[in-house]
Interface confidence: medium
């Protein structure tokens, strides 16, 4: 479908691109000796970037540190030293720059303070870092300030003494609303959820914590759970892992009403050494990983129903190293329903799997056209693509970047990978898919950094090398043809590519440093591609594309989760600007229901490459129990339930029957006597 990528040869060269890019390349040399640089974008489409450089010298007793703060308001073309706005204070990099949600223009920097001080110090800005106000805190912060997603004036923070502090006026004044707090999170509607320890400490009381809620920023509280191990929020679901009465195992409970009522999730219980992890969640459903007993490095992915209660097995032997460890689970944001992850095969090698229907069925990634199977393959003609993600990066393989996709660059997925029977230790190449992961092509030889600009109109890449570099590569046809541009005569040690989040910008910043005998000097080059994409795209530059299309002759072609979507996509041959205001144009249409629109109900699973749901052998002939809103129920089922978010109508519709035996659940957690309200007086 697409040829092998070409670099500068057999490709339509863009006229005068070197002159156009040279005129739009802006260098900025940072006049300091810092060891590290962190960069944050402030707001959306504002062009404002904050750069914090830090230089630290560990001395015998204390460490001496210096920070510099720079600001750009033209997407990184020019920077101004604004260190004086923060009184030349040393900023604590472990807290990062706390940027407010949406376009609030709010920024908080946490300063280093001397040992004997009563509290910490922050610098606050609400005008996109034009001005900062110094504020001394009545506590020492343990975590970065957390903004309420609904109101950026509302902040919460945990102190080093485990106090929960809240501000209602963007950090000007603070109030401690609770002590002995282990974990706190914002929920919807400015609700705060937090766990507290009752006896000793967060660590000692793990499994005996209480889960509390306040809906009025700390005036009143409600205890919504006891015997808590931990909790999490995903989509519209609130999850808590709760210790069992009889042993040291724990189970997941789910609430969709902010903790007023709870249901026991139909997931296996886990022991002390195991863990649960919410891999992904949206308003419809959740992907949950349940760790296998023992130090296996894998577990099982389950997908939920629309209540987050009934789960079906989605993928076995899912790679997830340890609690808080590495998993390759990746949401392909450029196409609905697509996720990629890694499994651990019986011989402990690692293989990539992809699902196109939100976890209903997983398969190997199709072998890229014209590619050879590598030495991991038994059969040199049959193999698949394996994607390097977080685990490979954590293990220091030659993989500079995780897979990349953007919601507004429809269908595009870029990733490092190898072609064989399993992930290889050989130096990877970069592969691209333009149809959301159905088909792949080698995009670049060897490891690269890459980014998407102008909603997919331009892809930019830089070779990963331990030598200084001065060449940037770019493609205007989704990775088929590449042009090389020398952005500086003096090569730099490259440290990162930076482009505005959202992939709408046409600017890319190349960060790095030059090194002489004793000094390291940070430098950035910002390249603006606006003159490469000279004109705005017009109607004729777009073509219709049916997503998830695998069989054009079939009336159900493109149907995923009960509907199909036709997109208007930029033609590969069109060299024009999508522009910052580009909105993905799509035309949805509903499909008739079939087996594909139903996940396997609790106690059933779909064998590989099968459509029918089959009863799990270990449950055959057993009655199925599950807890729903505090009642124990027996479930009789024909094995199917509609996939959350599925919009199919008509066609096949297997029914499901639930008998309510109205027996109480045994979980203390659901005991209403435990749910009491308190006032903060």
């Amino acid at each position: 479908r697409r040829g092998a990528p070409a670099e500068d040869q057999d490709c339509g060269r863009l006229p005068d691109f070197i002159a156009k890019l040279t005129n739009n390349t802006h260098q900025h040399v940072f006049d300091d000796l810092s060891g590290s640089v962190s960069l944050s974008w402030v707001g959306d489409s504002t062009g404002v970037i904050l750069v914090l450089t830090t230089f630290q010298v560990p001395l015998v007793i204390v460490s001496f540190g210096q920070s510099k703060l720079y600001r750009s308001e033209d997407y990184g073309k020019n920077f101004k030293d604004i260190t004086n706005l923060i009184n030349n204070t040393f900023i604590r990099t472990e807290f990062g720059m706390a940027i407010g949600p949406e376009n609030s223009g709010k920024v908080i920097l946490t300063a280093e303070v001397s040992g004997g001080s009563r509290g910490g110090r922050v610098f606050r800005s609400s005008d996109f870092a034009k001005n900062f106000v110094q504020t001394d805190l009545p506590f020492h912060p343990l975590t970065q300030m957390m903004y309420s997603p609904q109101n950026s004036d509302y902040l919460l923070a945990l102190s080093t003494e485990n106090g929960l502090w809240v501000s209602k006026n963007f950090g000007e004044k603070w109030e401690e609303i609770h002590k002995a707090v282990c974990l706190a999170k914002w929920g919807p509607n400015n609700i705060i959820f937090f766990t507290t320890h009752v006896n000793g400490s967060c660590k000692a009381d793990l499994g005996a914590l209480e889960l509390w809620r306040t809906s009025d920023l700390g005036k009143t509280f409600k205890t919504i759970g006891v015997k808590i191990y931990s909790f999490g929020l995903g989509g519209r679901f609130l999850f808590a892992s709760v210790m069992a009465d009889k042993d040291t195992t724990r189970r997941i409970h789910v609430s969709t009403d902010q903790g007023d009522t709870w249901s026991m999730a139909q997931l296996p219980s886990v022991g002390q050494e195991q863990f649960y992890s919410i891999l992904a969640a949206n308003e419809d459903m959740v992907f949950m990983h349940v760790d296998e007993p023992g130090d296996t490095g894998f577990g099982t992915i389950f997908t939920s129903d629309d209540r987050g209660i009934v789960y079906s097995k989605s993928l076995d032997r899912h790679l997830y190293t340890t609690t808080g460890g590495e998993t390759d689970f990746t949401n392909v944001t450029s196409l609905r329903g697509v996720y990629i992850t890694s499994t651990l095969s019986e011989d402990n090698s690692i293989q990539s799997m992809i699902t196109f229907d939100q976890g209903g069925r997983w398969e190997h990634l199709r072998k890229p056209e014209n590619s050879k199977c590598d030495a991991t393959a038994k059969n040199k003609n049959e193999c698949s693509l394996h994607i390097h993600a977080s685990y490979s990066i954590s293990q220091k393989l030659n993989v500079p970047m995780a897979p990349l996709s953007e919601p507004n660059a429809v269908g595009i997925v870029i990733a490092h990978g190898s072609v064989g029977d399993a992930i290889s230790v050989m130096v990877p190449d970069v592969y691209i898919s333009d149809d959301g992961g159905y088909s792949w092509a080698k995009m670049l030889e060897g490891p690269h950094y890459y980014t998407i600009l102008d909603s997919g109109g331009i892809i930019v890449a830089i070779e990963h090398s331990n030598r200084p570099i001065n060449v940037i590569k770019f493609s205007t046809d989704e990775g088929q043809c590449w042009q090389s541009y020398v952005f500086t005569q003096e090569p730099i040690y490259f440290t990162g590519l930076a482009s505005e989040p959202g992939a709408r910008s046409m600017n890319i910043s190349i960060w790095g440093f030059t090194e002489s005998f004793i000094t390291r000097q940070w430098v950035s080059y910002t390249v603006d591609f606006k003159d490469i994409l000279e004109r705005n795209c017009e109607e004729d530059d777009y073509t219709t594309w049916l997503a998830h299309s695998t069989d054009p002759g079939d009336y159900k072609d493109g149907c995923i989760l009960g509907y199909k979507e036709q997109f208007l996509r930029l033609r590969k041959s069109s060299v024009c600007q999508n522009g910052r205001d580009y909105v993905v144009a799509k035309q949805p249409s509903v499909c008739p229901c079939s087996l594909e629109d139903f996940l396997c109900d609790f106690g059933y699973f779909r064998p590989e490459n099968a459509s029918e749901c089959v009863e799990q052998p270990e449950l055959k002939g057993h009655e199925l129990e599950f807890c729903l809103y505090g009642k124990e129920e027996h479930l009789t089922t024909n094995g199917y339930r509609k996939i959350p978010g599925d919009k199919c109508q008509g066609g096949m519709n297997p029914a499901r029957e639930v008998k309510d035996l109205k027996k109480k659940c045994t979980s203390n957690f659901l005991n209403p006597t435990k749910q009491n309200s308190k006032s903060n007086s």
Partner: antibody, heavy 127, light 107 residues
């Protein structure tokens, strides 16, 4: 096809440094894989000495770590072993080998399963 | 480090008969186990990896089984070229360790 060939002196004096080189043909070291050294004292079993990844990351057997250095020279397509302060106990056949191309999961992070071996070179430590 | 113990040290078998070699790990190595064959004056050759997967070009008469701490290499019908020393190796943890070997000799 891929071939490995060990080379180096067959006789080393006690307390000196044993130096061996493994030349790789039919495959570019810089394209990946792990490259390891294993030894076998006369009439005994196999002992893993250490491995190097093409990028230069090294992994050594703790029992030998203080004396071992493994390095890679991608321009010459070879990797080398240096074992310092040798004694008679270091007398063995020394093999170089290529680690499997598969990336295995495990707590050791980089794991070696040797799929191609050199024919070995006998090194005697004696004065 | 993980200690690999092979038994028996020597196994006497007639050509055409079945040979069963054992390898025990001092702690679980999951399925991260390989078997090698070594003939006199030659380098070892990879036979089995992942406890049960045959390496490229290895005849079907060689099979591996087991997981955790107990592993077996079976040669279903010994050919004259199969008389050699067999080593097991774990590759779960550094340092990588080999068993002491089992010599399969003609009865």
């Amino acid at each position: 096809q891929v071939q490995l060939q060990e080379s180096g002196p067959g006789l080393v004096k006690p307390s000196e440094t044993l130096s061996l080189t493994c030349a790789v043909s039919g495959y570019s070291i810089s394209s990946g894989y792990y490259w390891g050294w294993i030894r076998q004292p006369p009439g005994k079993g196999l002992e893993w000495i250490g491995s190097i990844y093409h990028s230069g990351s090294t992994y050594y057997n703790p029992s030998l770590k203080s004396r071992v250095t493994i390095s890679v020279d991608t321009s010459k397509n070879q990797f080398s072993l240096k074992l310092s302060s040798v004694t008679a106990a270091d007398t063995a056949v020394y093999y170089c080998a290529r680690g499997s191309p598969r990336f295995y999961y495990g707590s050791g992070s980089y794991l070696d399963l040797f799929d191609i071996w050199g024919q070995g070179t006998m090194v005697t430590v004696s004065s | 480090e993980i200690v690999m113990t092979q038994s028996p040290a020597t196994l006497s078998v007639s050509p055409g008969e079945r040979a069963t070699l054992s390898c025990r790990a001092s702690q679980s190595v999951s399925s991260n186990l390989a078997w090698y064959q070594q003939k006199p004056g030659q380098a070892p050759r990879l036979l089995i990896y992942g406890a049960s997967t045959r390496a490229t070009g290895i005849p079907a008469r060689f099979s591996g089984s087991g997981s955790g701490t107990e592993f077996t290499l079976t040669i279903s019908s010994l050919q004259s070229e199969d008389f050699a020393v067999y080593y097991c190796q774990e590759y779960l943890n550094y340092p990588i360790t080999f068993g002491g070997g089992t010599k399969v000799e003609i009865k």
